[in-house]
């Protein structure tokens, strides 16, 4: 008799999930020699332990603590780049500006980037058919709780000037419901963080508006100021030129506004 299986609204666990996590861990330690003390088998066991045999709507930050401990990593606290709805450009930037870090440049972020996973209550099986959707099913699912946990820790670690890249093409440039808006903003430590500098990335070629005046940016400024952190904002009118100038700052065309 086929066992009844909960059907969730979201996509199932990414295929080859265990192999991918393990391979990513090994790759990360190969290219980041300072993390070679990490035992990737233990990392996978801790990752698995956070969600296997647990109801996928009943996951807590506590479930991820063993993994958090194994993945403890020191990044320069004044070199943190947060992002919201513009991941690819943020990653292209840290790929060029090697001394800055997004969450996905850390071991735990690198392990889980773009993956989906969940288990089932009381069985050791991984559910490859479906996983809970944050909106339609539940917010305390394995993926959402993981990102909430690592994002909180990443924001808590930040100091001095923290940068955030925001997507100027979206209707809500700053979205209170994004991970940045709901987790990271509220976990920046005012005693350590002096300024949050937003970079608003323009999408259109001819878009010369000052998106730093957008109502949602003003809302972000208000939230940040209330937390005793200074706020500044820059328009990045030409993201392609911006990246090019990060690569080649001495280029003569890089003195003008980008």
């Amino acid at each position: 008799v086929p066992r009844w299986r909960q059907q969730w609204s979201g996509p199932g666990t990414t295929k080859r999930f265990p192999e991918t996590v393990l391979a990513r861990c090994v790759k990360y330690t190969e290219i980041h020699p300072e993390m070679r003390h990490v035992d990737c088998q233990s990392v996978w066991d801790a990752f698995k332990g956070a969600f296997i045999s647990k109801h996928p709507c009943n996951i807590t930050e506590e479930d991820y603590q063993p993994l958090m401990k194994l993945g403890t990593q020191t990044v320069p606290c004044n070199k943190i780049l947060l992002w919201s709805r513009i991941k690819d450009l943020a990653h292209q930037f840290t790929q060029v500006q090697r001394d800055m870090f997004t969450l996905e440049d850390t071991l735990l972020g690198y392990l889980a980037d773009d993956l989906t996973w969940c288990g089932e209550f009381n069985t050791s099986k991984i559910n490859y058919q479906s996983c809970p959707d944050w909106r339609k099913d539940c917010s305390n699912n394995p993926v959402s709780v993981f990102w909430k946990t690592v994002s909180r820790r990443f924001a808590e670690a930040a100091c001095d000037v923290v940068h955030v890249m925001l997507n100027g093409s979206r209707s809500k440039i700053f979205d209170k419901n994004s991970t940045f808006g709901s987790v990271e903003v509220h976990n920046l430590q005012p005693e350590k963080v002096q300024t949050l500098e937003a970079w608003v990335i323009h999408g259109g070629r001819e878009d010369s508006r000052d998106l730093c005046q957008d109502p949602t940016i003003k809302e972000l400024e208000s939230i940040i100021s209330k937390r005793n952190i200074q706020f500044s904002c820059k328009n990045i009118y030409r993201p392609d030129k911006f990246l090019q100038c990060v690569k080649n700052p001495e280029d003569s065309s890089c003195t003008s506004e980008i």
Partner: antibody, heavy 123, light 112 residues
Framework: QMQLVQSGAEVKKTGSSVKVSCKAS????????MHWVRQAPGQALEWMGW????????DYAQKFQDRVTITADRSMSTAYMELSSLRSEDTAMYYC????????????????WGQGTLVTVSS | DIVMTQSPLSLPVTPGEPASISCQSS???????????LNWYLQKPGQSPQLLIY???TRAAGVPDRFSGSGSGTDFTLKISRVEAEDVGVYYC?????????FGQGTKLEIK
């Protein structure tokens, strides 16, 4: 079995570019970092850079930073190394290479190598 | 960058006799994980390099037990207990403790 097969020998003019390919088979291409190493005639081995084929992220030796571009085509399980502004000193054998994994740890040594691609730069 | 220095640069050996190659690094290659990131390769004439030893003393798959690696944080030795004709080629040490990985200048082993 695991194999890295590289493109054929190239003869290039000074100032031009060359693009060498390395086709991987016998393993999941995105699970391993791919490195590039070169060897000028009668000289020692020289590491040029790596690519993570899954993410496309790269890192290059300072010496080649401005002239080398390593890319990967996941659908073809192939890595590429392009070297621009060629000079006579770039005449060398170019290799792609990857580590082995020993019980979930990268061995730290290049256990698998392509057969090499000879690039000759002439004026 | 870490500098790797090999000696001798040329090593003529009689078959059946032992051989020893030295390698020095400008910094310790001992990682906090307890492993020493020193590798040895053999490049036979006309071939790609092949990994012989990794982590200073661990033989790679399929490497005969006549090859052994030893050393401390900065001084390393590759020993061949009894040289065979097929062992001719250039031997390279390499550090992989940090980027960029760097190689020694090579030791050419030839049969007397």
């Amino acid at each position: 079995q695991m194999q890295l097969v590289q493109s054929g020998a190239e003869v290039k003019k000074t100032g031009s570019s060359v693009k060498v390919s390395c086709k991987a088979s016998g393993y999941t291409f995105t699970d391993y970092i791919m490195h590039w190493v070169r060897q000028a005639p009668g000289q020692a081995l020289e590491w040029m850079g790596w690519i993570d084929p899954e993410y496309g992220s790269t890192d290059y030796a300072q010496k080649f930073q401005d002239r080398v571009t390593i890319t990967a085509d996941r659908s073809m399980s192939t890595a590429y190394m392009e070297l621009s502004s060629l000079r006579s000193e770039d005449t060398a054998m170019y290799y792609c290479a990857r580590v082995a994994i020993i019980t979930t740890v990268a061995s730290g040594g290049f256990a698998y190598w392509g057969q090499g691609t000879l690039v000759t730069v002439s004026s | 960058d870490i500098v790797m220095t090999q000696s001798p640069l040329s090593l003529p050996v009689t078959p059946g006799e032992p051989a020893s190659i030295s390698c020095q690094s400008s910094e310790s290659l001992l990682h906090s994980n307890g492993k020493t990131y020193l590798n040895w390769y053999l490049q036979k004439p006309g071939q790609s390099p092949q990994l012989l030893i990794y982590w200073m003393s661990t033989r790679a798959a399929g490497v005969p037990d006549r090859f052994s690696g030893s050393g401390s944080g900065t001084d390393f030795t590759l020993k061949i207990s009894r040289v065979e004709a097929e062992d001719v080629g250039v031997y390279y040490c390499q550090q992989f403790l940090e980027y960029p990985p760097t190689f020694g200048q090579g030791t050419k082993l030839e049969i007397k």
